[in-house]
């Protein structure tokens, strides 16, 4: 899987997860959250040759003839496969708010 | 949606659905499908800004973050996600197969 | 264990290209990020530019004319360029890491590189 | 740029003693900063980031904390070691910069 384990310990061009810190005032302009100050985004970054962790059929077969015509800018990408929510603390007034946001942190990625 | 009813009938820089002719036997070598010769394939290009079509939480907060630090490449990507199966003629031997190969056909796209 | 070691030439004649390497090991250059920081003698630190994971480059905007920043992930090496030094540019140069991608500070530093630009 | 300024320039302290660095960031840098330690002839060492987070293997006499735009180092019992030159740096926006540097000397 081209997740932590893998990818932060290899030098690894082609598609993999990359370390990125997100810091919510600073980096979104968000000031609305209160805790955390920031958290580990992560994404997807690298090539997508033939076979390197090809996500479907057509992704493939993409990346098969992208070997061809490469001129066609017709490969695929690297994206996020598995997400997991972050916890946020927020508030409404003077009232401390608890809620998950769904799909904010890139655990693994995939070529698609 | 992506797809192309939108795309086909705009000029749109931005992520978007790209038609693509693929041969078998030209572009990926595959000389043993009988039938088609070839399909229309597709596939998914394009920038993504801000709130284009973001396909989760974690693909809006990059592309966000991503207006302000371009040269991280930590940009979400245009690809694929509705897919469909394309029908194939093939022979073992002398024996016609028919088989329904899935995900080989993009019908939209989105920024992931 | 990580550890980031800078190398070249200590003495670079005025207006020619100042040359410098960064060899790193225990960690990826497609993981983190390393940046270039220097310090004249006696004087405080100034950051001058950085190189990511994905090979992206940001520079200190005081001195994006002159400097160049790319790096070999293969060997696990980071190079500076800096053109058209002067006098201004004697000090010891180092190369550090950031502990995550756009986290900005740096816990892990080379040990230095003194270049001293004279005729 | 964003300029950051140190005080005192040097600050005299005996062994055993508190010692309070102060840095002020001249706009709002919303708790990027940290704070480096170098000793002659060697490079920095990051002691605190995000403020207040102490890095790890570093002693817990080192504190950060901060007020409005005035961001403090404190040592709260200086051991002979601990005699050296001490760096505030923004991580909030490039470029980054830092401030010139307190020298902590023995009294």
């Known amino acids: 899987a081209l997740d932590a384990a893998y990818c932060f310990r290899n030098v690894q061009d082609n598609c993999c997860l990359r370390p990125l810190y997100i810091d919510f005032k600073r980096d979104l302009g968000w000031k609305w959250i209160h805790e955390p100050k920031g958290y580990n985004a992560n994404f997807c970054a690298g090539a997508c040759p033939y076979l390197w962790s090809s996500d479907t059929q057509h992704s493939r077969v993409l990346s098969l003839y992208n070997t061809i015509n490469p001129e066609a800018s017709a490969s695929p990408c690297c994206v996020s496969q598995d997400l997991e929510p972050l916890t946020i603390l927020y508030y409404i007034g003077k009232t401390p708010k608890i809620e998950q946001l769904s799909n904010m942190i890139v655990k693994s990625c995939k070529c698609s | 949606a992506l797809d192309a009813a939108y795309c086909f009938r705009n000029v749109q820089d931005n992520c978007c659905l790209r038609p693509l002719y693929i041969d078998f036997k030209r572009d990926l070598g595959w000389k043993w499908i009988h039938e088609p010769k070839g399909y229309n394939a597709n596939f998914c290009a394009g920038a993504c800004p801000y709130l284009w079509s973001s396909d989760t939480q974690h693909s809006r907060v990059l592309s966000l973050y991503n207006t302000i630090n371009p040269e991280a490449s930590a940009s979400p990507c245009c690809v694929s996600q509705d897919l469909e199966p394309l029908t194939i003629l093939y022979y073992i031997g002398k024996t016609p197969k028919i088989e329904q190969l899935s995900n080989m056909i993009v019908k939209s796209c989105k920024c992931s | 264990e990580v550890q980031l070691q800078e190398s070249g030439p200590g003495l670079v004649k005025p207006s020619e290209t100042l040359s410098l390497t960064c060899t790193v090991s225990g960690f990826s250059l497609t993981t983190y990020n390393v940046h270039w920081v220097r310090q004249p003698p006696g004087k405080g630190l100034e950051w001058m530019g950085l190189i990511w994971n994905t090979g992206g480059t940001r520079y200190n905007s005081a001195l994006k004319s002159r400097l160049t920043i790319s790096k070999d992930t293969s060997k696990s090496q980071v190079s500076l360029k800096l053109s058209s030094v002067t006098a201004a540019d004697t000090a010891v140069y180092y190369c550090?890491?950031?502990?995550?991608?756009?986290?900005?500070?740096?816990?892990?530093w080379g040990p230095g590189t003194l270049v001293t630009v004279s005729s | 740029e964003i300029v950051m300024t140190q005080s005192p320039a040097t600050l005299s302290v005996s062994p055993g003693e508190r010692a309070t660095l102060s840095c002020l960031a001249s706009e709002d840098i919303y708790s990027n900063l940290a704070w480096y330690q170098q000793k002659p002839g060697q490079s920095p060492r990051l002691l605190i980031y995000?403020?207040?987070s102490l890095q790890d293997g570093v002693p817990a006499r080192f504190s950060g904390s901060e007020s409005g735009p005035e961001y403090t180092l404190t040592i709260s019992s200086l051991q002979s070691e601990d005699f050296a030159v001490y760096f505030c740096q923004q991580h909030h926006a490039y470029p980054f910069t830092f401030g010139q540097g307190t020298k902590v000397e023995i009294k």
């Open positions: 550090a890491r950031d502990p995550v991608p756009n986290k900005w500070h740096f816990d892990f």
């Open positions: 995000d403020a207040r």
